[in-house]
């Protein structure tokens, strides 16, 4: 029997009947065995076929076999109902070998020319399967020359049989208090040859409850308990299962916080699997009852381990744990069924006793000592000497625990000193220097610091004075000893004030005239205003109408008297304003340099002399009564004058304060 070529030789060629293309002889039998490489098959087709036709090709025939299977028995020239001729058909081996047998019987009624066939090896596409046949691979099939291989979708691994895809379904741990788990691909059929392990692991104190839901379909057997595929449920206490078949198992109350679910499948079957919805329970905590004026959130039918609630108080109430205020409150249910924190109280917000108002007082409006939410208090300033600044003084205890004004301010109102109050009323006529009485010049300040000088209190922490009086102390403000509230220069009964800073007008040049002879002293503390210590007012825009020529101003101080000594008692003198040109002319003569009197100065005194301020009065205020407001204001600051105080034809020269209002206001607002 001739053999065809064998692999690894090239596998292709031609076969023909004996004597072809001539007629074949009788009683011929010829056999060819063709072999292709593994993973290949043989393809065969006929280019000529002319054999004796007989019933079921019993006489002459060509038989094609592959292994034990006969692929075809061929005869004749064309196919009939019972006989087959190859025609244009192509024949394929089932494996890698093909047997071809030619036989002719003892006679032919007429001559037949036989057959001619060609063959070749070709790759088998193992991935193509006939309908109804099992697929080559579980998931993905990849053909290649001489073979194929299988691969799996994500989440699966190729079984050692190289065809089946086993699910990677172990090691999943569920830690939430409830959830769902199911067989792989549920509700589609679950994978074969898989072993799945799922863990539910909750905190100690919880008990897992398993409910099988929707459908249950696991391969079973009528006689043996789950021999193929099965589901098992294991806790630290007991094992449940195995489960299989089509009936939903009953709820399982595990009484355990840890559960292991095992699902094992074999190589066959087509079942949809299972789905479990799990929940958990624990010992419930006592139902939280909200404190008065508070509410619980969230509201639940019951609260178990790890459940929590918060308490929120109504507006105007605050959380208190004992006596300690809390920003927030959340309690958590513990495994023993108790809450981790005791219930707080919602206590009405208490703003506490209101702060004392410097130079003022506070009155309880709602009730004596009532400082709780919505309580009202009224601040007021000490009458006569203080007035409240831009505020009605009414404060309400708000929900944030702060006393709040009607304008929403949380800061205290400000009691501003009333300025320009004096026990003295001006008489208008001029008379000699005389002793001041208590309360006449409550703004009068005695400044000691190398020399004796004066100043005037502004507000409750500033002193207005002359630049030349404090020039030497401008860099050592603390060296200034500032006294007020006394008439006697040598009395120990004064109010002591200390300088924090000295501000000398930038236009003042020491020892080069007295232009811009003005300075401010900032005190390091506010002084208490009373009948003996009261600030002087600054001039209003309209003040010049009270400071015309011949209008009376009053100068006060402890400066030199006619006897040539510093006065023991505060003295004052009423003097008229002098025409500016007249004053300028008086100081044009030597020894005074030209231009000594500037537009920033005003002059006051008698042409006849005798009434004047003198050394030691420097920095003190020349004051005027504003007849509209009935308050005294500072029009001038004692600055300079003739060498001999009170000299006829010479006048006291004062810094014109109205020219410096912006400077004063800027300094005070900035510092």
């Amino acid at each position: 029997t001739p053999l065809g070529p064998k692999w690894p030789e090239p596998v292709f060629g031609r076969l023909a009947s004996p004597g072809f293309p001539g007629e074949y002889a009788n009683d011929q039998e010829r056999r060819w065995t063709l072999t292709a490489p593994p993973g290949y098959r043989l393809r065969l087709y006929f280019t000529h076929f002319d054999l004796e036709l007989s019933h079921l090709c019993e006489y002459d025939f060509v038989k094609l076999s592959s292994g034990a299977k006969v692929l075809a028995t061929l005869c004749g020239q064309e196919s009939t109902d019972t006989e087959r001729a190859p025609g244009k058909d192509t024949f394929y081996s089932l494996g890698s070998s093909l047997d071809i047998t030619f036989r002719s019987d003892y006679s032919n009624e007429k001559p037949f020319t036989g057959f001619e066939a060609f063959y070749a090896a070709e790759d088998i596409d193992e991935c193509q399967v006939a309908p109804g046949e099992a697929p080559t691979c579980d998931h993905h099939c990849h053909n290649h020359l001489g073979g194929f291989y299988c691969s799996c979708r994500a989440g699966y691994v190729l079984h050692r049989n190289k065809r089946t895809c086993s699910a990677l379904c172990s090691g999943q741990v569920f830690t939430q208090r409830s959830g769902e788990l199911s067989s792989p691909e549920y509700p589609r059929p679950y994978p074969k040859l898989s072993s799945c392990t799922y863990s539910i692991s909750l905190e100690e104190g919880f008990s897992v409850i398993l409910d099988f839901v929707e459908s249950f379909d696991v391969e079973t057997h009528p006689e043996t308990l789950c021999p193929y595929d099965f589901l098992k449920i294991q806790t630290d206490r007991e094992e449940h299962g195995p489960f299989c078949g089509k009936t939903l198992p009953h709820r399982i109350e595990t009484k355990s916080n840890t559960v292991t679910i095992t699902f094992v499948t074999d190589e066959s079957g087509d079942h949809t699997g299972w789905k479990i919805h799990y929940t958990s329970t624990a010992q419930p905590c006592p139902y939280p009852m909200a404190p008065p004026n508070g509410h619980v959130s969230p509201v639940q039918a019951k609260y178990i381990l790890k459940d929590s609630f918060s308490i929120f108080c109504e507006t105007g109430y605050e959380l208190l744990q004992g006596h300690l205020p809390l920003k927030s409150f959340t309690a958590v249910c513990q495994k023993d069924g108790s809450w981790d924190r005791p219930m707080p109280a919602c206590s009405i917000v208490d703003c506490g006793p209101p702060d004392d108002l410097p130079s003022g007082r506070v009155e309880y409006i709602t009730g004596p000592g009532v400082t709780t939410y919505k309580a009202v208090i009224q601040y007021s300033c000490e009458e006569t000497f203080y007035t409240m600044k831009v505020n009605d003084g009414k404060y309400v205890c708000e929900a944030d625990g702060f006393w709040t004004s009607s304008k929403g301010e949380k800061s205290l109102p400000v009691c501003e000193p009333v300025c320009g109050l004096s026990a003295r009323t001006t008489g208008g006529r001029i008379y000699g220097g005389q002793k001041a009485k208590p309360g006449d010049f409550p703004w009068q300040v005695l400044i000691l610091g190398g020399t004796t000088a004066a100043g005037a209190l502004l507000y409750d922490n500033w002193v207005l004075t002359a630049a030349h009086a404090v020039y030497e102390q401008k860099h050592d403000a603390s060296a200034l000893d500032i006294r007020m509230g006394t008439l006697k220069r040598l009395s120990p009964h004064y109010t002591q004030a200390w300088s924090e800073a000295v501000f000398i007008h930038e236009g003042y040049t020491h020892d080069a005239g007295f232009d811009n002879d003005i300075a401010l002293i900032k005190l390091n503390n506010k002084v208490v205003i009373n009948s003996n210590i009261t600030p002087i007012c600054l001039p209003r825009k309209e003040a010049e109408s009270f400071m015309r020529t011949d209008d009376i101003g009053t100068a006060s101080g402890w400066g030199l008297t006619q006897r040539g000594f510093l006065a023991r008692n505060l003295m004052y003198v009423d003097i008229p304003i002098v025409d500016h040109q007249k004053c300028t002319a008086a100081y044009e003569k030597p020894p005074y340099p030209r231009g000594s009197v500037t537009a920033n100065m005003l002059c006051a005194g008698l042409e006849s002399g005798g009434k004047d301020s003198c050394r030691g009065d420097s920095g003190g205020a020349l004051v005027f009564l504003d007849s509209e407001t009935e308050r005294w204001f500072v029009g001038g600051i004692v600055s300079w004058g003739s060498m001999n105080c009170g000299e006829a034809g010479q006048y006291g020269v004062y810094t014109k304060v109205i020219n410096y209002i912006p400077w004063i206001e800027n300094i005070i607002s900035d510092f």
Partner: antibody
């Protein structure tokens, strides 16, 4: 030299009054304030009040406002302190002291020798 | 009223020792004054305006401090310095004294 000489020791019954004198010399009496202080046995110093020798302006601490009276006799340069409604706790050495007039005016540069006042029934 | 607290209340020291007495005020004071008192005698001014030595007072005495804390220092204690020392303030009415510090011979 500047000195203050006080009157001698006194023994008084409770409810009585005592008047202690303090004669100044060696300075201009009316230029200064005179202060009065006391010291109970084994105790510290306590200020009572003061008087301006020039015009008799007085100041007392609250405790002594109703019982102490400070006066001046310019002609003899003498200051007086009278304490009424005496009680046993008023037993003390009473001092007059001159107030400084050079700096703060708030301390005592010259002291009398002290007068012991004993209040006992 | 401003309270003045002296410390120590008493101390024992030897001739030549350096002695420091402190006076603590309940509120800030601008100036402190110090007096020395010997048994049966009137007090005598030592220091005025915190740090100035009164007339006739030996230079071994010195004062310092500010605010609420003031100190009297005797740099080298002499036999005649054994006495009681008082601080005094009048920054705030009424004037007040400390309770005294007794310096005794060791």
């Amino acid at each position: 030299q500047v000195q203050l000489v006080q009157s001698g020791a006194e023994v008084k019954k409770p409810g009585a009054s005592v008047k202690v004198s303090c004669k100044a010399s060696g300075y201009t009496f009316t230029n200064y304030w005179m202060h009065w202080l006391r010291q109970a046995p084994g105790q510290g110093l306590e200020w009572i009040g003061d008087i301006d020798a020039s015009d008799s302006e007085t100041h007392y601490i609250e405790k002594f406002k109703d019982r102490a009276t400070l006066t001046i006799d310019k002609s003899s340069s003498t200051a007086y302190m009278e304490l009424s409604s005496l009680r046993s706790e008023d037993t003390a050495v009473y001092y007059c002291a001159r107030g400084d007039i050079t700096t703060t005016l708030r301390y005592f540069d010259v002291w009398g020798q002290g007068t012991l006042v004993t209040v006992s029934s | 009223d401003i309270q003045l607290t002296q410390s120590p209340s008493s101390l024992s020291a030897s001739v030549g020792d350096r002695v420091t007495i402190t006076c603590s005020a309940s509120s800030s004071v601008r100036y402190m004054y110090w007096y020395q008192q010997k048994p049966g005698k009137a007090p005598k001014l030592l220091i005025y305006d915190t740090s100035n030595l009164a007339s006739g007072v030996p230079s071994r005495f010195s004062g310092s401090g500010s605010g609420t804390d003031n100190t009297l220092t005797i740099s080298s204690l002499q036999p005649e310095d054994f006495a009681t020392y008082y601080c005094q303030q009048w920054s705030s009415y009424p004037l007040t004294f400390g309770q005294g510090t007794k310096v005794e011979i060791k």
